[in-house]
């Protein structure tokens, strides 16, 4: 799992590859802060609850965020 509590940022390694939006349990976007100078995106998968760190600079990940946002706006009344 590419996570660590011993460094200021949560993510050690990040992926440029998107996942299927339907396989996501949760998608956390952690803004840059005094503790970590970069935006971090943590995807929790439905299967096994595995967490993955995604690269916010990747176009494919931006496309994923767009798809998730669109899906959420469809669901909300």
């Amino acid at each position: 799992v590419p996570l660590s509590r011993t460094v200021r940022c949560t993510c050690i390694s990040i992926s440029n590859q998107p996942v299927n939006p339907r396989s996501l349990e949760k998608l956390e976007i952690i803004p840059a802060s005094q503790f970590c100078p970069r935006v971090e995106i943590i995807a929790t998968m439905k299967k096994k609850g595995e967490k993955r760190c995604l690269n916010p600079e990747s176009k494919a990940i931006k496309n994923l965020l767009k798809a998730v946002s669109k899906e959420r706006s469809k669901r909300s009344p």
Epitope: N16, Q17, V19, A67
Partner: antibody, heavy 119, light 107 residues
Framework: EVQLVQSGAEVKKPGATVKISCKVS????????MHWVRQAPGKGLKWMGW????????TYADDFKGRFTFTLDTSTSTAYMELSSLRSEDTAVYYC????????????WGQGTTVTVSS | DIQMTQSPSSLSASVGDRVTITCKAS??????IAWYQQKPGKAPKLLIH???TLQPGIPSRFSGSGSGRDYTFTISSLQPEDIATYYC?????????FGQGTKLEIK
């Protein structure tokens, strides 16, 4: 040199199953997602979906849900596309294409595999 | 899904001619369009990405422009080896879509 080498042409009967391979070389297989594209005879390109090569998770375009299965063998840097219950309309050239995910376009393609479905 | 309407579907031109192909997206694709060349019996080859960025090794007679929903691919001076079918691809979405293709022939 980055290369995607696909398996050879297949002739199958209706109802059969075909499995096409796409073996990559020249880069780290798990660094890029792999997409599949279909081209029916004399027709245009149709995107079928992709597989995340880090976790082996496939995503299918709406028109390719059900009979299509994308899988991987990371030990041999090979992606597979399996198509079951073949019909005559599945006759096409199937391409694998590497997606340069950081920018999200297809930068390298396999040479294509022709699948002919005929009784 | 985003639809890509490519025109014309076929085009006949002479060597040295300026050739233009257009793709219109059903919504704004923020310049995320690529252009591919496909010769008979061969795989598509990437020529241009992000509207106008030429791939290394691609001749400068190929160019692209556009924004919003409207995009153009141009060959400034047609060469015999440019005879092929050309496709646009939008990638501003998790669901990719190709244009229908333009078959380019020599007069």
């Amino acid at each position: 040199e980055v290369q995607l080498v696909q398996s050879g042409a297949e002739v199958k009967k209706p109802g059969a199953t075909v499995k096409i391979s796409c073996k990559v070389s020249g880069y780290t297989f798990t660094d890029y997602s792999m997409h599949w594209v279909r081209q029916a005879p004399g027709k245009g390109l149709k995107w079928m979906g992709w597989i995340n090569t880090e976790i082996g998770e496939p995503t299918y375009a709406d028109d390719f849900k059900g009979r299509f299965t994308f899988t991987l063998d990371t030990s041999t840097s090979t992606a597979y596309m399996e198509l079951s219950s073949l019909r005559s309309e599945d006759t096409a050239v199937y391409y694998c294409a590497r997606n340069y995910d950081y920018d999200a376009y297809f930068d390298v393609w396999g040479q294509g595999t022709t699948v002919t479905v005929s009784s | 899904d985003i639809q890509m309407t490519q025109s014309p579907s076929s085009l006949s031109a002479s060597v040295g001619d300026r050739v233009t192909i257009t793709c219109k997206a059903s919504q704004d694709i923020n310049k995320y369009i690529a252009w591919y060349q496909q010769k008979p019996g061969k795989a598509p080859k990437l020529l241009i990405h992000y509207t106008s960025t030429l791939q290394p090794g691609i001749p400068s007679r190929f160019s692209g422009s556009g924004s919003g929903r409207d995009y153009t691919f141009t060959i400034s001076s047609l060469q015999p080896e440019d005879i092929a079918t050309y496709y646009c691809l939008q990638y501003d979405n998790l669901l990719f879509t190709f244009g229908q293709g333009t078959k380019l022939e020599i007069k």
